[in-house]
Structures are given as structure tokens and as C-alpha cells.
């Protein structure tokens, strides 16, 4: 007798642990920026502080009738999903509500900004334990709202936002598009994307993961013991805010980067039917449904990585795309992807003291994506080694020449526009371990890292016959840090990582042209962290 | 997202000298004006003036006051609704869109964003 959504996100082995934990023991505080709420509801009574913060626009229409239970509906339900006694994810977590949405569920960017500033002021006046901010709202893309989220996140606050219910690219909305927030899309009881009338959950590269958001039972403001079901990415975000609160209550020192990486790593993979999303968004949208991760004590020492896609470069000849990791993360590799296959490769460069992943469009190309592999590597010291393009017919080799540094990724960038004259680059694992090898006119970049116990190896998989993609996975216990496509067809679309799988994509037209001897190879660099071991390259 | 996606950024065409005030003429506007790409979600008449990151507390107030003073010279009344100190330097202002050009030329201004709606999801 447990609602489907709680069963989905809280594994059975966590249920009993939760049943033993006393209410109100957590020092974590969740701030909810939403409508007013009914604080006397049994689900949340005694654990909610209704602040005096109120910054909302007037309701539309002369005939609008302000009915308390309707005004409180959205916020009360979300408060219940986060910390409700019976239907909450983080039962007993204290919650502070700020009213930034009116009785019609409308607010303003400015009101939200003032709300975020109120939280920052509260934090300065009375520093407390970990803070989680739930933003179950969305407006059009706003540079200042995203900037405010960035500033607040840098003070150690964890922000969780709804992806939006517009069946659209979440990157077009704020705060969903802010890289520093954990952005959550919505799935139903069948783990499929939520449809809401003619619209539904947002998607795309700005979504970090999905969570239950359809027919979610939660506190109803209609009465002090009532429940109702509501749907939307707000409900999904509330689940993740609850999960984060539980993670922080067990381990209060977890950082935003660690929380996000652990949420991604321990989520349920590949259950969402990606066909629901527009074709061009499928590769960018994470196939992840949130579950409560185990504590780091149970899973210590794991190397955690995630894939970060850039925005599309646009079609101009010199258009570049840039993908960035979070400040705490290490950029272990950079690859690129273009639907037309017309790209001039990728490289890593330092901008403002931070390594970024760049990709360059080619003449006649429709644009590229840069794909960064961002990892949490404790006490890492990483550097980029590059070699300019060799003369015609010669290979370019780059290896990690510093002692105890291992190769975590390779990037290749071609100087020439003419796609027909160049061969694809190669990683040679057998003949030259730990080297990136480029062919004609390719500049080669090797990402080299030193960290206690870090060891890496290359794993390749080639297919000679017709195939739209070639994949290679790192085995259990190893984490994918680099992914490249090696020589084969004259035209490859590029390579990217999906969880622990390296995907090399080939152009449709290239399949027909290819001779059977010309294999397309997906090359993965797989690493693991063994704190007791020395950094090493595994043959 | 680093890029500004489906977002309107307008460089307003500004006369170099609007009323012969030396300090205004000296400051060339490099600031941009931004607004929501969805017209129905815009709130014209309310603007968030965002200042450069290192702007000091006193300078924020001075900038807001300067905007009020210069607007008054042109016969406009503007209302500063809120001053942002803690998350970013800036202020929220209710004013005519006619004054955007003037506001963009103020020292310390990085960009101005028109207020817009957000919605429960």
C-alpha cells in the first residue's frame, strides 16, 4: 500500500531504512517557491514554515474569485510530495514556503529573483545546514534568472527546477536552462514521458533526468487530510528535491556536483521510449529516471562521469559549439557530433581558467555539437597535450608523457575543409598503448590525468558491414571517460557517450559506399579509481 | 545553457547625445536589452537593470538614483521597486520603454531585461 511514484524512486532496501528514521531529524531545509500553501494539512503540519515572503502579480480578469483552497493547491501538493508524512519522498524534512505564484499559478521573473534573494539573505543572517531550493515554475529563457540561480548555487545551495510542461526544448525556458540547477522532466507509471493534454514534459540537453510526474498522490488543500493527484514537471522536480534532501540528510557535505553525478549514476537507465521526443532531441535527452542512491559509504571510490552536450553551433562555416563541465568536475574528454557529418572535429581549450570542450562546423555542414565527458576525480591533476597537424601522409601521435598520468580522452581537429582528403583519426591501443593517433591534417589533443589510483584502458569495437552506429561499453566497475570514432567510412557523424556506452555514428549514405574491409570502430577509454593503487595504463 | 537560445537581444540604436549632457554623451552604451521571446509572456514597463558583477552597494543605489534624475529631466517619473544587493547587483524599475536607451547608457549597466511571467508547472 504505497503510491507507485514512491515505489519507483525509493528502492525496497531503502523503504525499511526510511521507516526506522525518526521524523524531523534532518538538518536539511527545503525552500519552495510556489503558490501559498495550506500549512495545517496533516501531511506537512509542523514541518512547514510559511514565510512572510509574497511577491506575486495581480490575478487576471475582473471576475476572478480568490478561493483559498484553490490558491494553495499547487504549493500544498508539492510540499506534500517533498516532505509529506505519508506521501512524501523525504518525510519529516523541514520546508519553507515563499509565495511567488498567484492564485492562477502565475508569477514573474522579478518576483522569483526577489524570492531567491530572500533565501540568500536568510542564509547570510542565519547560516544553517544544507539548503535545497525547489523551483516548480518556468518562464521563457531569462539570462538574469539563470544568473541568479548560478550565484545562489555557488553559495552551496542546491537548486532543483521543473523542466517545463511545454513539450519543447527545456533550454528555451528558465530556470530549467540554467546549468547550475538540477532540471527534471516528468515520466508516468510506465516510465514514459508525461503527456499533458496536447503538451507534455520538456526534454533535451538541459534536462538532467526524469522523475515521476503523472497522477502523483499528494496533499490536497481542499481539506487538512485530503489527497489528490496532480501531474507535471513540478511534481517530478519535487521528487528529486526530496531525494536530494534525503541524500543531504545522510551526508550533509555532498556538493552539487556530487549530488548530480550520483543522481545520474544511480538512476534507472534506458526505460524511457525515446520515440516520444522529436528526432533531433532524442540523442540529447537523458534516458534516466531518478531513484534514491545509496550512501557514498556503501559505494565509495567510484569514478562518476556524465555527458554534457553543448548548444547546437548553428550552420555558419566557422560556427563553434562549446560544452562546459561544472567547476568541480574534470573535463576528461571531448568529442563532437554532426547530423550531416560535416564537422571539423573537436578540441579542449582553457577559457578563463576552465577547460572547455569545443567543436567546429565544416563548410556546408548544418552545425555541430560539442560533447564533454565531465567527471568527479578526487585530487585530480589533468592537462591537455596537443600536436599540430602532421604533413600529408603522416600520422600524428600524442601520449601522456608526465609520470603517472593516464590517457582519459582524445580529440581531433582538422585544419582542412575538404572532407574527402582526410582519413579519420585513430586510437592505437595495442601497438602504442595510451596514445592518441591522428591522420592527415589532424591536430591531436590528449587529455591526461593523474589521480590516486586512477587506471585506464582502451576498448574498441568495429563493424565492417552496414551499420548506422557502432557501440562499445565499459564493463562493470569501469567508467567511460572518452569516446571516439575511428577510421572506416569516409563520413562519420561523430561520437558521444551515453552513460557507460560509447556510440560512434555513421552517415546513412556512407553505409552504401563502404567496402567490407573498411571497419568503423568505436573506441572507448574506460577508467576506474582504486584509491589504494597507483595511476596506471592497463594494456 | 550558455547561448541565449530563443531569446531576444536588442542593441538599441542610441543617439550619441540626447540632451547635451556631457557625462551621458561620454558613455557609449555597450549594454544590451533583452526580453522574452514569447510576446504574451512579456511585462513591458517593468525592467530588471543588471549591473556589472563587481559593482559596489553604493554604486547600485547611485545608478538607480541617476536613472531617476535623468528620467525626471525628460519629464518621466520612474519607480525603483527593488534593489538587488545579495545575489547580483541591480534593481527593478517601473518605467516607460522610452527610457531604455537612457538606462542602457548608465555606467555599470551590463544589460537590462524586461520582466516576464513564470508559470506553475
Amino acid at each position: 500500500s504505497i503510491p507507485w511514484n514512491l515505489e519507483r524512486i525509493i528502492p525496497a532496501w531503502h523503504q525499511t531504512e526510511e521507516d526506522r528514521s525518526p521524523d524531523g531529524s534532518s538538518q536539511v531545509e527545503v525552500y519552495l517557491l510556489d503558490t501559498s500553501i495550506q500549512g495545517a494539512h496533516r501531511e506537512i503540519e509542523g514541518r512547514v514554515t510559511i514565510t512572510d515572503f509574497n511577491s506575486v502579480p495581480e490575478e487576471d480578469g475582473t471576475r476572478f474569485h480568490r478561493q483559498a483552497s484553490k490558491c494553495d493547491s499547487h504549493g500544498t501538493h508539492l510540499a506534500g510530495v517533498v516532505s509529506g508524512r505519508d506521501a512524501g519522498v523525504a518525510k519529516g524534512t523541514s520546508l519553507h514556503s515563499l509565495r511567488v505564484l498567484n492564485c492562477q499559478g502565475k508569477g514573474t521573473v522579478s518576483g522569483t529573483l526577489i524570492g531567491l534573494e530572500f533565501i540568500r539573505k536568510s542564509q547570510l543572517i542565519q547560516p544553517s545546514g544544507p539548503l535545497v531550493v525547489l523551483l516548480p515554475l518556468a518562464g521563457g529563457y531569462s539570462r538574469i534568472l539563470n544568473a541568479a540561480c548560478r550565484h545562489l548555487a555557488r553559495t552551496g545551495v542546491v537548486l532543483v527546477a521543473a523542466a517545463g510542461n511545454f513539450r519543447d526544448d527545456a533550454c528555451l525556458y528558465s530556470p530549467a536552462s540554467a546549468p547550475e540547477v538540477i532540471t527534471v522532466g516528468a515520466t508516468n507509471a510506465q516510465d514514459q514521458p508525461v503527456t499533458l493534454g496536447t503538451l507534455g514534459t520538456n526534454f533535451g540537453r538541459c534536462v538532467d533526468l526524469f522523475a515521476p510526474g503523472k497522477d502523483i498522490i499528494g496533499a490536497s488543500s481542499d481539506c487538512s487530510t485530503c489527497f489528490m493527484s496532480q501531474s507535471g514537471t513540478s511534481q517530478a522536480a519535487a521528487h528529486v528535491a526530496g531525494i536530494v534532501a534525503r541524500m543531504l540528510s545522510r551526508e550533509p557535505t555532498l556538493t552539487l556536483a556530487e549530488l548530480r553525478q550520483r543522481l545520474i549514476h544511480f538512476s534507472t537507465k534506458d526505460v524511457i521510449n525515446m520515440a516520444w521526443f522529436p528526432e533531433d532531441q532524442q540523442v540529447l535527452t537523458p534516458n534516466l529516471v531518478a531513484t534514491l542512491p545509496p550512501s557514498t559509504h556503501e559505494t565509495g571510490g567510484q569514478l562518476l562521469c556524465r555527458t554534457v552536450w553543448s548548444a547546437h553551433s548553428g550552420p555558419t562555416r566557422t560556427a563553434t559549439a562549446t560544452a562546459r563541465c561544472a567547476p568541480e568536475e574534470e573535463l576528461l574528454s571531448c568529442s563532437s557530433f554532426s547530423r550531416s557529418g560535416r564537422r571539423r572535429g573537436d578540441w579542449i581549450e582553457a577559457i578563463g581558467g576552465q577547460q572547455v570542450c569545443k567543436a567546429l562546423n565544416a563548410f556546408g555542414g548544418e552545425g555541430v555539437y560539442a560533447v564533454a565527458r565531465c567527471c568527479l576525480v578526487p585530487r585530480a591533476n589533468c592537462s591537455i597535450h596537443n600536436t599540430p597537424a602532421a604533413r600529408a601522409g603522416l600520422e600524428t601521435h600524442v601520449h601522456c608523457h608526465q609520470k603517472d598520468h593516464v590517457l582519459t580522452g582524445c580529440s581531433f581537429h582538422w585544419e582542412v575543409e575538404d572532407l574527402s582528403v582526410r582519413r579519420q583519426p585513430a586510437l592505437r591501443s595495442r601497438r602504442q598503448p595510451g596514445q592518441c593517433v591522428g591522420h592527415q591534417a589532424a591536430s591531436v589533443y590528449a587529455s591526461c590525468c593523474h589521480a590516486p589510483g586512477l587506471e585506464c584502458k582502451i576498448k574498441e569495437h568495429g563493424i565492417s558491414g552496414p551499420s548506422e552506429q557502432v557501440t562499445v561499453a565499459c564493463e562493470a566497475g569501469w567508467t567511460l571517460t572518452g569516446c571516439n570514432v575511428l577510421p572506416g567510412a569516409s563520413l562519420t557523424l561523430g561520437a558521444y557517450s551515453v552513460d557507460n556506452l560509447c556510440v560512434a555514428r555513421v552517415h546513412d549514405t556512407a553505409r552504401a559506399d563502404r567496402t567490407s574491409g573498411e571497419a568503423t570502430v568505436a573506441a572507448a577509454i574506460c577508467c576506474r579509481s582504486r584509491p589504494s593503487a597507483k595511476a596506471s595504463w592497463v594494456q | 545553457q550558455d547561448e541565449d537560445g530563443d531569446y531576444e537581444e536588442l542593441m538599441l540604436a542610441l543617439p550619441s547625445q540626447e540632451d547635451g549632457l556631457a557625462d551621458e554623451a561620454a558613455h557609449v552604451a555597450t549594454a544590451t536589452f533583452r526580453r522574452c521571446s514569447k510576446e504574451a509572456w512579456r511585462l513591458p514597463g517593468t525592467y530588471i537593470v543588471v549591473l556589472m558583477e563587481e559593482t559596489q552597494r553604493l554604486q547600485i543605489e547611485q545608478t538607480a538614483h541617476r536613472l531617476q534624475t535623468r528620467a525626471a529631466r525628460r519629464g518621466y517619473v520612474i519607480k525603483v521597486l527593488h534593489i538587488f544587493y545579495d545575489l547580483f547587483p541591480g534593481f527593478l524599475v517601473k518605467m516607460s520603454s522610452d527610457l531604455l536607451g537612457l538606462a542602457l547608457k548608465l555606467p555599470h549597466v551590463e544589460y537590462i531585461e524586461e520582466d516576464s511571467f513564470v508559470f506553475a508547472q
Epitope: P3, A40, R42, I217, D222, C223, T225, C226, F227 | -
Partner: antibody, heavy 126, light 106 residues
């Protein structure tokens, strides 16, 4: 069929603490579908809700009695208990325990008090 | 708190007659109102919930109506076992009970 049975001393001295236990049989307390409730009825008067508890020990009290009430649950014994401190003659009443569907699992039935124990009279007197 | 006022305090009727009991709330309780029956020396028993729904095993002669602030419990034809005290209860805001209406034999 679920049954509830109240037990505890029938006489308590003023300023002392009233303690009662309700034993649940024919069903388990361990369920997120229910709250376990105490209600009282002074002689010849109406009913007053005292407070409720769920299987996790999460409580919800009548604001007018909150400062004096403690409700606890012992899932291993399938019991829940009431403690009312600093009692006076005004606390003399028949004390009932009852089950309330929480509403979180709609299939569990209506969100009201049903069934009830038969009640136990507690007299506060020196 | 929401105060529930029941009227009349006592209703004297004969078996077979129709009984109409009223419960008025000090503020709207929507349809979150129940009716209980209590016989001497017994615990209350749930009759009607959410203003108009009969609880399991309750005869069809019992019906409830109303919403907002005014509610009615109707016993279409009184049986001997129906003579008891009836309480209304709301759950719109916490839980409160009415003072009760005693239905006695005339």
C-alpha cells in the same frame, strides 16, 4: 475483521499523567494507509479529537491539547498509546481509539474514523 | 477552529416517521462532513461520509445531503434501532464534532 481495544487505569489523580494503550487485532498497524487516533467524550457531552499517529510514529495533535499530549506507536506489539499530562477533572471522559484511513491509498476506503474501540472511562479525581 | 452546530438538540419521533437532522458549520467545509450514530454504552459508528456517501453496511433509509455550511441527515422511516445520538464531524480543517442530536421515541 479489524478490532480495537483500549486499556489503562480507570482512575488518575489530578496533575498526573493519564496513560492508555490501544491494541489492534485482525489487522496490522504497519501500513501507510491508516492513521491511529484517540478521541474522547466527557460524560454527557460531545466528542473531541485528541490526536493521530501513523505507523512511522508521525503524529498530528489537536492544537488545544498539543502541549499535553504524546501519542506513540509500537508496531512490534501492534499497539499505540496515549499520554496526557497534567490532567484535571475536565479530562474525565470516555477515551476511544479509532482507525482513520489516511487517504494516501484511495482504495483503502473513506478518509474517516472507522472502526472504533468500545471506549474506556477514565476519571480524574484525588 | 470550525464549529459545528447541530439542531435540534433533541428530536422526538415515532417509529416509521421521517427524521431530519441539521448540522451547520461556522465556515465552509465543502463536502468534508460525516455523520456518526452512537447508542448508549457503545462507540460511535460511521453512517455517512463526504456529506452523502453511505458507509459499508448502512441501510438505504439513511441519506446525507448538503455542502459548504449546511448539511442534513435524513432517516426516511425510523426503525426502533435508529433511536440514538447522531453526531456530525468535519475534516476540512483538523477534526471537530457537532454537539449531537438525540433522536428519542415519542
Amino acid at each position: 475483521q479489524l478490532q480495537l481495544q483500549e486499556s489503562g487505569p480507570g482512575l488518575v489523580k489530578p496533575s498526573e499523567t493519564l496513560s492508555l494503550t490501544c491494541t489492534v487485532s485482525g489487522g496490522s498497524i504497519w501500513s501507510s494507509s491508516y492513521y491511529w487516533t484517540w478521541i474522547r467524550q466527557p460524560p454527557g457531552k460531545g466528542l473531541e479529537w485528541i490526536g493521530s499517529i501513523n505507523y512511522r510514529g508521525s503524529t498530528y495533535y489537536n492544537p488545544s491539547l498539543k502541549s499535553r499530549v504524546t501519542i506513540s506507536v509500537d508496531t512490534s506489539k501492534n499497539q499505540f498509546s496515549l499520554k496526557l499530562s497534567s490532567v484535571t477533572a475536565a479530562d474525565t471522559a470516555v477515551y476511544y481509539c479509532a482507525r482513520e484511513n489516511s487517504g494516501v491509498v484511495p482504495a483503502a476506503g473513506p478518509n474517516w474514523f472507522d472502526p472504533w474501540g468500545q471506549g474506556t472511562l477514565v476519571t480524574v479525581s484525588s | 477552529e470550525i464549529v459545528l452546530t447541530q439542531s435540534p438538540a433533541t428530536l422526538s419521533l415515532s417509529p416509521g416517521e421521517r427524521a431530519t437532522l441539521s448540522c451547520r458549520a461556522s465556515q465552509s467545509v465543502s463536502s468534508y462532513l460525516a455523520w456518526y450514530q452512537q447508542k448508549p454504552g457503545q462507540a460511535p459508528r460511521l453512517l455517512i461520509y463526504d456529506a452523502s456517501n453511505r458507509a459499508t453496511g448502512i441501510p438505504a433509509r439513511f441519506s446525507g445531503s448538503g455542502s459548504g455550511t449546511d448539511f442534513t441527515l435524513t432517516i426516511s422511516s425510523l426503525e426502533p434501532e435508529d433511536f440514538a445520538v447522531y453526531y456530525c464531524q468535519q475534516r476540512r480543517n483538523w477534526f471537530t464534532f457537532g454537539g449531537g442530536t438525540k433522536v428519542e421515541i415519542k
